[in-house]
């Protein structure tokens, strides 16, 4: 997260972080007792490693109560996800058995109604990603509010060119933006989740080119069917 | 296949107003922005303004300011031009193009302003 | 406004050749270029975005280069439908700018 701060512990309970062998390598948002939500290309850059999720954390090294790592039973990436673009950049990460809830870990409940959120809509991004250009990760969680821009400015040439469909959303990127290791995070509005961070290779805190996040409301039935 | 259909040809007389419309299809009209840009006879290209379909936010050559209106109707993906006060220089193809992704362009409309 | 200067404003070619329009802006506009092509009662058609991206469908002849206030349109090998008039625009900074065209005839 870039221009942001530390995020007051443990105070969004549903966040994840999608580990390999042991590092964090994307964020994730719990949806499910059993189920997390992330970005479809961050099993990309798993390779052959083992996959975990980390519930329950505010700081990624240091022992906390309600930190617990769950091994993945079942990744199911969205099956139009391909390497080569960020369409239905989704990932759904079965955990083997369910979370232990508590006041750290709790599902957050995810925007259904098929409908764009209003631009200039506030809305919070958290994760463990980078904090400055230089690529410096943080230990401890952060987090951004960051206002939604509507997509025919996200679209435009000096933006991402045409390349936002209607089952993306943008959000403005003016210093304060999400960047690598947030990817599969949540972008949450109003206390709803409404995107999920894309892992592209997006340069970040640029103006002109907009956080990309993906609309899980445009997902609702391949959510439903996968956690079903 | 993305549409760009415009309306016919006008001709008017000097100190009328004219209205240009331009037909999206083929993708979502809300999604990008449309700039209009005129080409009068023998000459190059010049850009009027453009409108965000979304907010109805309109961004002006400062030439055409006083004269340019820009309006959407999303209901039937249509964009406007108006151009008041017409003069014999105002006599041009008129373009509405999409702005962002491929080049669409419409097909232009020849507006004839003579006395 | 940013000026867009292009040149030349005509030029006489065979097929085969290999042909540069070169266009100077009159302040940087990064790499907020594109090219257009446009023949006579046709709407222009759009060649290259972002200074050297070429548009689907544009043969690979086509090349662009650039950035800051230096740009250039290449046709490595000028074929007959090629003959037309060629514009540049800036799009980075209000009101968008074209060049004054340069118009590529038959020798």
């Known amino acids: 997260i870039l221009g942001g701060r530390e995020a007051e512990a443990h105070a969004r309970p549903y966040m994840a972080s999608v580990q390999v062998n042991g590092e964090h390598l994307c964020g994730g948002v719990l949806v499910a007792e059993q189920w997390v939500l992330s970005a479809a290309h961050c099993l990309e850059d798993a390779a052959d490693g083992k996959v975990q999720v980390l519930l329950g954390a505010h700081s990624l090294s240091q022992p906390e109560p309600s930190k617990r790592l769950y091994d993945v039973l079942r990744a199911v990436p969205h099956p139009d996800s391909r390497p080569d673009t960020i369409d239905h950049d989704l990932l759904l990460l079965q955990l083997s058995e369910k979370a232990t809830l508590g006041p750290a870990v709790r599902p957050l409940p995810w925007q259904r109604v098929d409908r764009d959120v209003e631009p200039g809509t506030l809305c919070d991004v958290a994760g463990w990603g980078i904090v400055s250009h230089a690529g410096r990760r943080p230990d401890r969680l952060q987090h951004v509010l960051l206002p939604v821009l509507d997509r025919a400015t996200c679209n435009r040439r000096t933006h991402h060119d045409g390349a936002i469909t209607q089952r993306m959303m943008c959000a403005e990127s003016n210093r304060r933006d999400s960047c690598k290791g947030d990817s599969g995070g949540p972008l949450v509005c109003g206390g709803v989740l409404e995107g999920v961070v894309t892992s592209g290779s997006r340069v970040c805190g640029n103006r002109k080119k907009p956080g990309i996040y993906t609309r899980v409301a445009s997902y609702a039935a391949w959510i439903d069917s996968v956690l079903a | 296949e993305v549409q760009l259909v415009q309306s016919g040809a006008e001709v008017k007389k000097p100190g009328a107003s004219v209205k240009v419309s331009c037909k999206a299809s083929?993708?979502?009209?809300?999604?990008?922005?449309m700039y209009w840009v005129r080409q009068a006879p023998g000459q190059g290209l010049e850009w009027i303004g453009e409108?965000?379909?979304?907010?109805?936010?309109?961004n002006f050559n400062e030439k055409f300011k006083s004269r340019a209106t820009l309006t959407v109707d999303t209901s039937t993906s249509t964009a406007y031009l108006e151009l008041s006060s017409l003069r014999s220089e105002d006599t041009a193809v008129y373009y509405c193009?999409?702005?962002?992704?491929?080049?669409?362009w419409g097909q232009g409309t020849l507006v004839t302003v003579s006395s | 406004d940013i000026q867009m200067t292009q040149s030349p404003s005509s030029l006489s070619a065979s097929v085969g050749d290999r042909v540069t329009i070169t266009c100077k802006a009159s302040?940087?506009?990064?790499?907020?270029v594109a090219w257009f092509q446009q023949k006579p009662g046709k709407a222009p058609k759009g060649l290259i975005r972002s200074a050297s991206s070429r548009y689907s469908g544009v043969p690979s002849r086509f090349s662009g280069s650039g950035s800051g206030t230096d740009f250039t349109l290449t046709i490595s090998s000028l074929q007959p439908e090629d003959f037309a008039t060629y514009y540049c625009?800036?799009?980075?900074?209000?009101?968008?700018?074209f060049g004054q065209g340069t118009k590529v005839e038959i020798k």
């Open positions: 302040q940087n506009v990064d790499t907020d």
């Open positions: 625009q800036q799009y980075n900074n209000y009101p968008l700018t």
């Open positions: 193009a999409r702005e962002g992704g491929f080049a669409y």
């Open positions: 083929g993708y979502t009209f809300t999604s990008y922005y």
């Open positions: 409108i965000n379909p979304t907010s109805g936010e309109t």
